[in-house]
């Protein structure tokens, strides 16, 4: 019988008492084969973290700073359940740390040196750790003691709880630096009052502070937020302009064998029976013998943290950067106005080799990071392990939902000013063999399908979106008899036609021979009935243009396109016979790297782009013999986006809506994780 006990870690006598009460009350409402609670008492949260890592306990609830400690080796804990606040309909699991300024003050985030600052309190998250952590590398050296460096950075501050004797500048705006509400500038409201009264130029608070202190929109409009990209936004746009997004209070468990499903089962049942307004005799979110025992008293319930989400992703790049800077105190030697090498994310072995060659030729301007799947690459860009990659539109959508931004678009048509003119897109098509003359768009059921990969535009999102509208369910593996859609579950019929060997079967990378445009077309040639690809795929792989044995004798005339009206047309008539227009592939990055990725890539394409005529003896960025490694092989240049610089603007309303509809069918664990952070 599996052990269904969750050993909860308590850090005080009062917590241990509440834990025992929790245990006893759960026993009374949960059947004997259900989850149960046991209590383990430790002296501190850090001791609880160590106990969970050592398998002496299973769970504890922590604030963000401790979630970071719990994640660090050797603890390796992960978030599994989040407390939420507010209503069940609009649950808040995060708050945003923001920098508020007066509207007419005219400076940006990178111009804070010499300004006057208002903090909620020394060592507090939104008021000190996050802003000072993010500004850490701009502080004057020596950066230790930190208070002295901060005092020398700003021209005056109010940082309640600071030592006014040793660091008088930190108490200049609030004499005495009192560490309670007796100091009018203490806490969130106090720090905002410090700004409002004109004592300070910037207040470091959380997003709700402004709304709690100014009920009137006209009053709020006198203030703005400083964004990390050195712009400003209105105070209600905090989701797009903050210093960090911080989880409020989180249950952590071991990453391996951590009982996360059992912990969720326990807490989900606990909130049903003992949550807000559920029971008089025991309340989960109430602490008669103290404050915030086991859980925050202000919590309204629990939400399961998506399994794909590790602590780094949960805490977010900005928060992790800030806390790491404060803890480790290390700053890059390079001057901050100089671009560091761009870390390109390469998928599997073949892309890594091409990337390495690029790295050598770029003389270190490009560095390479490997991942096995596109989603793993996106996650690495999110957390700073990588910086950029070029993505199909379907993944631009996921990357956008994860906070990344498009920076340059692949262009596929030669034109005089290629780099200045991003194209409208390419055509997603359905290709069949001419010999299968009875096959149309209307009788694909039961046929064998070939897809570039799950989640990609021409190979999946567009055809499956159209199909979903017809069949109204997500069981595409039942609609087709079999197929190859790399990235599908291994036991799915949509992996049956794939050709990868062993663990590489159906993997969404080049180790699977039927992956990508060329792979999906090869799947059609060798096994399938229909391939969902781009309009250039057939001409690029026929007429001897692809020298591979499977492709070298193919003739374009032997293939036709399926039109949505039930007719068929020759391959060259794609403009009048396609499934939809697809947005071109685009390079994505984090917002903080946008300018440098743009600058370095434009330099790189001038050196190694389409202007290189002899690719046999020189490195060519956009060539890999039909394998589409790093970029599509038909890329002519990378073009500026002008104002299409968010994923919604880049992909266009129609495509975003189409992918949004298909999200009901999404198997993307990354998309699930990212929409948890930003619904």
């Amino acid at each position: 019988v599996p052990d269904k006990t969750v050993r909860w870690c308590a850090v005080s006598e009062h917590e241990a008492t509440k834990c025992q009460s929790f245990r006893d009350h759960m026993k009374s409402v949960i059947p004997s084969d259900g989850p149960s609670v046991a209590c383990v008492k430790k002296a501190s949260y850090l001791d609880c973290i160590r106990a969970i890592a050592a398998n002496e306990a299973d769970a504890v609830t922590l604030d963000a700073g401790l979630v970071y400690d719990a994640y660090l080796a050797p603890n390796n804990l992960k978030p599994v359940v989040a407390e939420f606040y507010g209503s069940k309909e609009d649950p808040q699991t995060f708050y945003y740390a923001v920098a508020v300024v007066k509207k007419d003050s005219g400076f940006q985030m990178n111009q804070l040196r010499g300004k006057k600052s208002c903090h909620t309190g020394l060592g507090r998250s939104a008021g000190w750790n996050i802003p000072i952590g993010l500004l850490y590398c701009d502080l004057p050296e020596p950066r230790k003691p930190l208070e002295k460096a901060v005092a020398n950075f700003f021209s005056g501050s109010c940082a309640p709880c600071a030592d006014g004797t040793d660091f008088p500048q930190l108490c200049q705006l609030c004499p005495g630096c009192g560490c309670s509400t007796l100091n009018q500038y203490f806490g969130y409201s106090g720090a905002f009052k410090c700004l409002k009264d004109g004592a300070g130029d910037v207040a470091f608070v959380k997003h709700s502070t402004i709304f709690e202190n100014l009920a009137n929109k006209a009053d709020r409009d006198q203030y703005e937020l400083l964004c990390l990209d050195n712009t400003r936004k209105p105070v209600d746009e905090y989701k797009d302009c903050h210093l960090a997004q911080v989880p409020s209070h989180t249950v952590v468990a071991r990453s391996m064998g951590g009982k996360e499903d059992l912990i969720w089962e326990l807490l989900n049942q606990a909130q049903e029976h003992f949550g807000k307004d559920k029971s008089k005799e025991f309340q989960l979110f109430s602490s008669p013998h103290g404050k915030d025992l086991l859980f925050k008293d202000s919590a309204h319930g629990f939400l399961k943290v998506p399994p794909r989400m590790d602590a780094k992703m949960y805490l977010g790049y900005e928060y992790v950067t800030a806390i790491r800077n404060l803890r480790e105190g290390t700053c890059p030697e390079a001057p901050t106005d100089e671009c560091k090498p761009v870390k390109w994310c390469a998928l599997s072995h073949h892309e890594r080799l091409k990337c390495d060659e690029w790295s050598v030729n770029s003389v270190g301007k490009i560095e390479c990071v490997s991942a096995e799947t596109t989603e793993d690459c996106i996650a690495k860009i999110m957390n700073g392990e990588a910086d950029a990659m070029s993505l199909d539109g379907g993944f631009v959508y996921i990357a956008g939902k994860c906070g990344l931004v498009p920076v340059l678009a692949e262009n596929y048509n030669k034109s005089d000013n290629c780099e200045d003119t991003p194209e409208a897109g390419y055509f997603a098509i359905a290709v069949v063999k001419k010999s299968a003359s009875d096959l149309t768009w209307d009788n694909l059921k039961g046929k064998k399908s070939c897809h570039t990969a799950v989640g990609r535009t021409a190979g999946w999102n567009i055809p499956m979106g159209l199909l979903y509208n017809k069949i109204n369910h997500c069981r595409f593996d039942e609609f087709f008899s079999e197929g190859c859609a790399p990235g599908s579950k291994k036991d799915s019929s949509l992996c049956k036609l794939c050709m990868g060997s062993g663990l590489n079967l159906c993997e969404p990378n080049n180790k699977e021979g039927y992956y990508g445009y060329t792979g999906a077309f090869r799947c059609l040639v060798e096994k399938g009935d229909v391939a969902f690809v781009k309009h250039q795929t057939v001409p690029q792989n026929t007429g001897g243009k692809n020298p591979d044995p499977w492709a070298k004798n193919l003739n374009e005339k032997d293939y036709e396109l399926l039109c949505l009206d039930g007719t068929r047309k020759p391959v060259e008539e794609y403009a009048n016979c396609h499934l939809a227009r697809a947005p071109n592939h685009a390079v994505v990055t984090r917002k903080d790297k946008e300018a440098c990725v743009h600058k370095i890539l434009r330099q790189q394409q001038h050196l190694f782009g389409s202007n290189v005529t002899d690719c046999s003896g020189n490195f060519c960025l956009f060539r890999s013999e039909t394998k589409d490694l790093l970029f599509r092989d038909d890329t002519v240049c990378l073009a500026k986006l002008h104002d299409r610089n968010t994923y919604e603007k880049y992909l266009g309303e129609e495509y975003v809506k189409a992918v949004g509809n298909l999200r009901k069918c999404s198997t993307s664990s990354l998309l699930e994780a990212c929409t948890f952070r930003r619904p």
């Epitope: 073949h350 050598v360 030729n361 046999s616 003896g617 490195f619 013999e625």
Partner: nanobody
Framework: QVQLVESGGGLVQPGGSLRLSCAAS????????MGWYRQAPGKQRELVAG???????NYANSVKGRFTISRDNAKNTVYLQMNSLKPEDTAVYYC???????????WGQGTQVTVSS
Amino acid sequence: QVQLVESGGGLVQPGGSLRLSCAASGSIFSINTMGWYRQAPGKQRELVAGITRGGTTNYANSVKGRFTISRDNAKNTVYLQMNSLKPEDTAVYYCTDYSSRYYHDYWGQGTQVTVSS
């Protein structure tokens, strides 16, 4: 297809030096960039140093200042001079060319370098 043969590995004490050679034969006219990789037991293969036909070089941070890559185009050979060797440099060293736009799956047999006292 280009054939590559690595040599020059061996056992050396920490602080010592070795010079690896890689001779290329086959359709070498198309070789532009060449690289030395290494793979330690249980680790991923990693690029150590690379050199273009024009002599532009690039190194992994862990070997900068200690290793030097060079090539003799007339002899179709690429070299890796390894100085101040450390125990963590122990690995099988492979040389590769990037002549094929297929970014091949084939590698030479490699040459074992062991740094130990």
